[in-house]
Interface confidence: medium
C-alpha cells in the first residue's frame, strides 16, 4: 500500500492525531489534503517544522497561502521563523523576525497565545 | 495581468541538450511554484516537474529524473526546464504553468508554449 | 502515479445539446481536480477547479462535479466556442497527471 492509499484508509481518524503522528506522517509520502490539514488540532500542529509541513502536504503545500489567515495555519506561522517560511517560496508573511530568540515559555504562550520573542 | 512569456521553438539533434525559459510579470514571482507541461503532437499533456522560486527546490516527474533540470533566476523572474540526451519521442510543445495562483489550485495561467523538434 | 481515464475519446455534439465527459482516476484523490479546455492551435484554459468550482470568467454551462475517484464535467448547452480538447488533471499527489482528452467536435 503506497502513502496516498493509506493516508485514504486513516483519513477520517486523524482530526485527533498527536504531533507524533503528524511527524510520523511526513514521513510517508502521504499528500494530505488541505481540507484535511484544516481540520487538524492546533496543538498537534503548531509543533511542526516548515520541512515536516512540506512533507505532509506534497503538492497541496502550495495552497498554504489560501489559508494563511486561518486557523490552524495562522497560529503555526507565528510559531515559525520567517527564515524558514521563505523557504517554501509561498510568500506567507507573520513568522517570528531573523534573529529573534523564541522562549517556549508555555505559560506566557497559553495566557498570549503567542510565543515570548527576545529582541536582537 | 499574468503574463508568461516562453523563448522561441528550437531544433535539436537526438543526444544534445535543450534550455527553454519563461519570464513572469504580474504578480510576485516568488510567491508560486512554476511547473513545466509538456505535450507531444497530437497528444495529451505531461506534466515534467516543479520549482519553488524561493529556494530553487524542485520536484520532478520520475520519467524525467535523471534527464530533466528546473531552475530559476530570481532576479529576472525567469523559470527554465532544460532537457538532456534528447531523443525524438521528445519533440513537443513544452509549457509553463505556475499552480495556485489567487489561491485556486490547478494551472491558471500557461505561456504560449515552446516547440522542441528533435531531428537528426 | 495516479492513472486518470478519460471517456469517451470523442464526442460530436449539436449546438444547443448538453454534453457530459467523464474522468476516473486509480486511487481516491478526493476532490483535488481540475479540468481544462484546449482550443486548436492554443495553450490550455483553466475551466473548474476542485472538481466543481468554476475560475472566473467560465461560463455557467460548463459545471463539474465528483468525489473521489469518479468525476464528470458537464456543459449544459454546447456552443461552437466550446470546441476542442478537454482534459482532466489530478493535482492530490506527485506526480501530477492528467487525463488522455476528449476531444469534442460540433455536429
Known amino acids: 500500500m503506497n502513502g496516498s492509499e493509506y493516508f485514504v484508509k486513516i483519513q477520517s481518524f486523524l482530526g485527533g492525531a498527536p504531533t507524533e503522528d503528524l511527524k510520523a506522517l511526513s514521513q510517508q509520502n502521504v499528500s494530505m489534503d488541505l481540507a484535511t490539514f484544516m481540520k487538524l488540532r492546533t496543538d498537534a500542529v503548531l509543533p511542526l517544522t516548515v520541512a515536516e509541513v512540506q512533507k505532509l502536504l506534497g503538492p497541496h503545500v502550495e495552497g498554504l497561502k489560501a489559508e494563511e489567515r486561518h486557523r490552524p495555519v495562522r497560529d503555526w506561522i507565528l510559531r515559525q521563523r520567517q527564515d524558514d517560511l521563505d523557504t517554501l517560496g509561498l510568500g506567507l508573511q507573520g513568522g517570528i523576525p531573523n534573529g529573534y530568540l523564541v522562549l517556549d515559555l508555555s505559560m506566557q504562550e497559553a495566557l498570549s497565545g503567542t510565543p515570548c520573542l527576545l529582541g536582537p | 495581468e499574468v503574463q508568461l512569456v516562453q523563448s522561441g521553438a528550437e531544433v535539436k539533434k537526438p543526444g544534445a541538450s535543450v534550455k527553454v525559459s519563461c519570464k513572469a510579470s504580474g504578480y510576485t514571482f516568488t510567491s508560486y511554484w512554476m511547473h513545466w507541461v509538456r505535450q507531444a503532437p497530437g497528444q495529451g499533456l505531461e506534466w515534467m516537474g516543479n520549482?519553488?522560486?524561493?529556494?530553487?527546490?524542485?520536484n520532478y516527474n520520475e520519467k524525467f529524473k535523471n534527464r530533466v533540470t528546473i531552475t530559476v533566476d530570481k532576479s529576472a523572474s525567469t523559470a527554465y526546464m532544460e532537457l538532456s540526451s534528447l531523443r525524438s519521442e521528445d519533440t513537443a510543445v513544452y509549457y509553463c504553468a505556475p499552480h495556485y495562483i489567487g489561491s485556486r489550485p490547478g494551472f491558471a495561467y500557461w505561456g504560449q508554449g515552446t516547440l522542441v523538434t528533435v531531428s537528426s | 502515479d495516479i492513472v486518470m481515464t478519460q471517456t469517451p475519446l470523442s464526442l460530436s455534439v449539436t449546438p444547443g445539446q448538453p454534453a457530459s465527459i467523464s474522468c476516473k482516476a486509480s486511487?481516491?484523490?478526493?476532490?483535488?481536480i481540475a479540468w481544462y479546455l484546449q482550443k486548436p492551435g492554443q495553450s490550455p484554459q483553466a475551466l473548474i477547479y476542485s472538481a466543481s468550482y468554476r475560475y472566473s470568467g467560465v461560463p455557467d454551462r460548463f459545471s463539474g462535479s465528483g468525489s473521489g475517484t469518479d468525476f464528470t464535467l458537464k456543459i449544459s448547452r454546447v456552443e461552437a466556442e466550446d470546441v476542442g480538447v478537454y482534459y482532466c488533471q489530478q493535482y492530490n499527489s506527485y506526480p501530477l497527471t492528467f487525463g488522455g482528452g476528449t476531444k469534442v467536435e460540433i455536429k
Open positions: 486511487q481516491n484523490v478526493g476532490t483535488n
Open positions: 520549482v519553488n522560486p524561493s529556494n530553487a527546490g524542485s
